[in-house]
Amino acid sequence: ATKLTEEKYELKEGQTLDVKCDYTLEKFASSQKAWQIIRDGEMPKTLACTERPSKNSHPVQVGRIILEDYHDHGLLRVRMVNLQVEDSGLYQCVIYQPPKEPHMLFDRIRLVVTKGFSGTPGSNENSTQNVYKIPPTTTKALCPLYTSPRTVTQAPPKSTADVSTPDSEINLTNVTDIIRVPVFN
């Protein structure tokens, strides 16, 4: 079998994973997209998914995971904030296209989270501490039935962060070194 390619990210606890999954094809723009973890010997498990149909430049938060789908650019932005050692593992982005099998987006992400905070910001984060407020309203994620249902928090209408992020207006509490969201949204 062909070995799927992986991109490795080594980060410290408390930092943020901030990656892009390219799908390029316009036909996938409105398709629902998901972030999955792949554990040895198990089926991929969906951790978060976009709405169906997926909205342009509209952040969706599931716990510490934030997904933003940029239709104009054919890419899904995935952020996992306040990383923990136990977040280490293999991840992938997929596009749901029922009744067909999900379409996997390359490359898979091999995340390695280690203990101890590094004072020097990594390549995917900065040293500014953003203080966010999690919006009170939640809705059920409309992820396919064969995955675990998750609670999705929609982005609030306006960020109360001390440093405003370009597209996402999701705010989290007690999170350090959050990469500020791309303004392209």
Partner: antibody, heavy 118, light 107 residues
Framework: EVQLVESGGGLVQPGGSLRLSCAAS????????MDWVRQAPGKGLEWVGR??????????EYAASVKGRFTISRDDSKNSLYLQMNSLKTEDTAVYYC?????????WGQGTLVTVSS | DIQMTQSPSSVSASVGDRVTITCRAS??????LAWYQQKPGKAPKLLIY???NLQSGVPSRFSGSGSGTDFTLTISSLQPEDFATYYC?????????FGGGTKVEIK
């Protein structure tokens, strides 16, 4: 045709006001964040501000240099973006572009020149 | 604010040359960087988004690389229509900021 067309530029005295418009066509305007970017004569590009899309409640962001003086608004029913500029200063003299984001402006207007001078 | 420092500010080159422009962010911006080309009297044109994604319709001689704080735009073989000013822009956080520009001139 997918395009953006700005209008409303002109000569205005310091302290005066001006309203720029940007007419969009060929795409679903309400789905997109829209920005204003300006360029002073012979200078580089400067981001002015953004109005987010309908899904993000049309919230706005501004550069510090224009905050409190400039207001960005939009009318999705008219596929139009606006920039209301008050208390204009000579340093606001520039070509103003409207642009569609967000991860890079793939669509720009042709620009409209605003000259602030006494 | 995130400062974007572009270098060089100008470069003289000949048709067929390989040209490299660099852009450095004052703090990490992940992959959220765009490159534009602008010709006199015209609006900028998007070349690269998300650091390395080539915008549709842009010739493959243009390429982008980098992440975090250091980014590069490369023109593999300069063509006559490539003489212009190039700008980088960070899209990671507000306020959005541009580099000062690099003018590519004919040697």
């Amino acid at each position: 045709e997918v395009q953006l067309v700005e209008s409303g530029g002109g000569l205005v005295q310091p302290g005066g006001s001006l309203r720029l418009s940007c007419a969009a066509s060929g795409f679903t305007f309400s789905d997109h964040h829209m920005d204003w970017v300006r360029q002073a004569p012979g200078k580089g590009l400067e981001w002015v501000g953004r109005t987010r899309n309908k899904a993000n409640s049309y919230t706005t962001e501004y550069a510090a240099s224009v905050k409190g003086r400039f207001t960005i608004s939009r009318d999705d029913s008219k596929n139009s973006l606006y920039l209301q500029m008050n208390s204009l200063k000579t340093e606001d003299t520039a070509v103003y572009y409207c642009a569609r984001g967000p991860l890079g402006y793939k669509l720009w207007g042709q620009g409209t020149l605003v000259t602030v001078s006494s | 604010d995130i400062q974007m420092t572009q270098s060089p500010s100008s470069v003289s080159a000949s048709v067929g040359d390989r040209v490299t422009i660099t852009c450095r962010a004052s703090q990490g911006i992940s992959s959220w960087l765009a490159w534009y080309q602008q010709k006199p009297g015209k609006a900028p044109k998007l070349l690269i988004y998300a650091a390395s994604n080539l915008q549709s319709g842009v010739p493959s001689r243009f390429s982008g690389s980098g992440s975090g704080t250091d980014f590069t735009l490369t023109i593999s073989s300069l063509q006559p229509e490539d003489f212009a000013t190039y700008y980088c822009q960070q899209a990671n956080s507000f306020p959005l900021t541009f580099g000062g520009g690099t003018k590519v001139e004919i040697k």
